[in-house]
């Protein structure tokens, strides 16, 4: 039975040209996290394997930085970066947990961070 929950940074906004940290945290389970995948819609941005470390897609390596921790930093943001991002936790023996973050990239300088929320 999967008992874990993923807490994410929720709905967030950031300024065009700036950077943002996407962060997820898996709790309420003793399952071993073997890998975390970061995806944007249908594209795989990066993976972080518990033993082999980070592997960033060459398509994104200029604008994606690993960390902090299991999070992902997006740099040089454009309005095209607006959309859904997913952290996918591969665990043993539980299986897969998925968290969702919605990022809005704003033209103005009034970007504010949204609230945190949980996905069971």
């Amino acid at each position: 039975m999967m008992t874990g929950t993923i807490e994410t940074t929720g709905n967030i906004s950031a300024e065009k040209g700036g950077s943002i940290i996407l962060q997820c945290h898996l709790s309420s389970t003793t399952a071993q996290v073997t890998q975390v995948n970061w995806e944007q819609q249908d594209q795989l941005l990066a993976i972080c394997n518990a033993d082999l470390g980070w592997h960033i897609s060459p398509s994104f390596k200029d604008r994606v930085a690993p960390g902090p921790g299991l999070g992902l930093t997006l740099q040089s943001l454009t309005v095209n970066d607006t959309g859904e991002y997913f952290c996918i936790y591969h665990t043993y023996p539980d299986g897969t947990y998925t968290g969702r973050i919605f990022l809005e990239v704003l033209e103005s300088s009034v970007a504010e961070h949204g609230a945190r929320f949980q996905i069971p």
Epitope: N37, Q43, L44, I47, N49, D51, L52, G53
Partner: antibody
Framework: EVQLVESGGGLVQPGGSLKLSCAAS????????MSWVRQTPDKRLELVAT????????NLPDSVKGRFTISRDNAKNTLHLQMSSLKSEDTAMYYC???????WGQGTSVTVSS | DIVMTQSHKFMSTSVGDRVSITCKAS??????VAWYQQKPGQSPKLLIY???TRHTGVPDRFTGSRSLTDHTLTISSVQAEDLALYYC?????????FGGGTKLELK
């Protein structure tokens, strides 16, 4: 030039033990996660163990869990695979592999037979 | 575990031919796919990673592509030295798994 040189293979009886080693050179060994991948006589490849760069985390599939142990000595640039309770299905060529499988050693052969 | 199926164990070709080696994943693995070449008596060597990126020193006649769960390694003009075993691998989900291999041989 990246070099990975495996040793320690041989013929062993079922239930026996063997320790494989891999000497690494040409790169900063302590910065890379490492793996052991085996190739069975029918040429199938199977990842049998991974270890974090600092040795603090390891992962092994169910097929070898409890029988195999992966370890490393960063001071000596060496990777190890301790294999015990060996079975005939463990017969394979064992390769030491760097990081995300970008460099492989030449392999060391393990035969489990009575 | 994700199963990577290389349906052709053998493929016959001629020098100069264009050949495509296919691999089907049992579920979507996005672009987390690598391809390896293994010549007789040698260890596997990385050719392609992230589905389409060539490893250092790999000739540009080798290209990788993806269509949903179907992954393809294409050699645009086969050379004699390309006759070898080719494996796909997924690293989308642990445990990482390999295809059964495709042996490229001369007609």
């Amino acid at each position: 030039e990246v070099q990975l040189v495996e040793s320690g293979g041989g013929l062993v009886q079922p239930g026996g033990s063997l320790k494989l080693s891999c000497a690494a050179s040409g790169f900063t060994f302590s910065s890379y996660g490492m793996s052991w991948v085996r190739q069975t006589p029918d040429k199938r490849l199977e990842l049998v163990a991974t270890i974090k760069s600092d040795g603090g985390s390891t992962n092994l599939p169910d097929s070898v869990k409890g029988r195999f142990t992966i370890s490393r000595d960063n001071a000596k640039n060496t990777l190890h695979l301790q294999m015990s309770s060996l079975k005939s299905e463990d017969t394979a060529m064992y390769y030491c592999v760097r990081g995300y499988f970008d460099y492989w050693g030449q392999g060391t052969s393990v035969t489990v037979s009575s | 575990d994700i199963v990577m199926t290389q349906s052709h164990k053998f493929m016959s070709t001629s020098v100069g031919d264009r050949v495509s080696i296919t691999c089907k994943a049992s579920q979507d693995v996005k672009t987390a796919v690598a391809w390896y070449q293994q010549k007789p008596g040698q260890s596997p060597k990385l050719l392609i990673y992230w589905s389409s990126t060539r490893h250092t020193g790999v000739p540009d006649r080798f290209t990788g592509s993806r269509s949903l769960t179907d992954h393809t390694l294409t050699i645009s003009s086969v050379q004699a030295e390309d006759l070898a075993l080719y494996y796909c691998q997924q690293y989308y989900s642990t445990p990482y798994t390999f295809g059964g291999g495709t042996k490229l041989e001369l007609k």
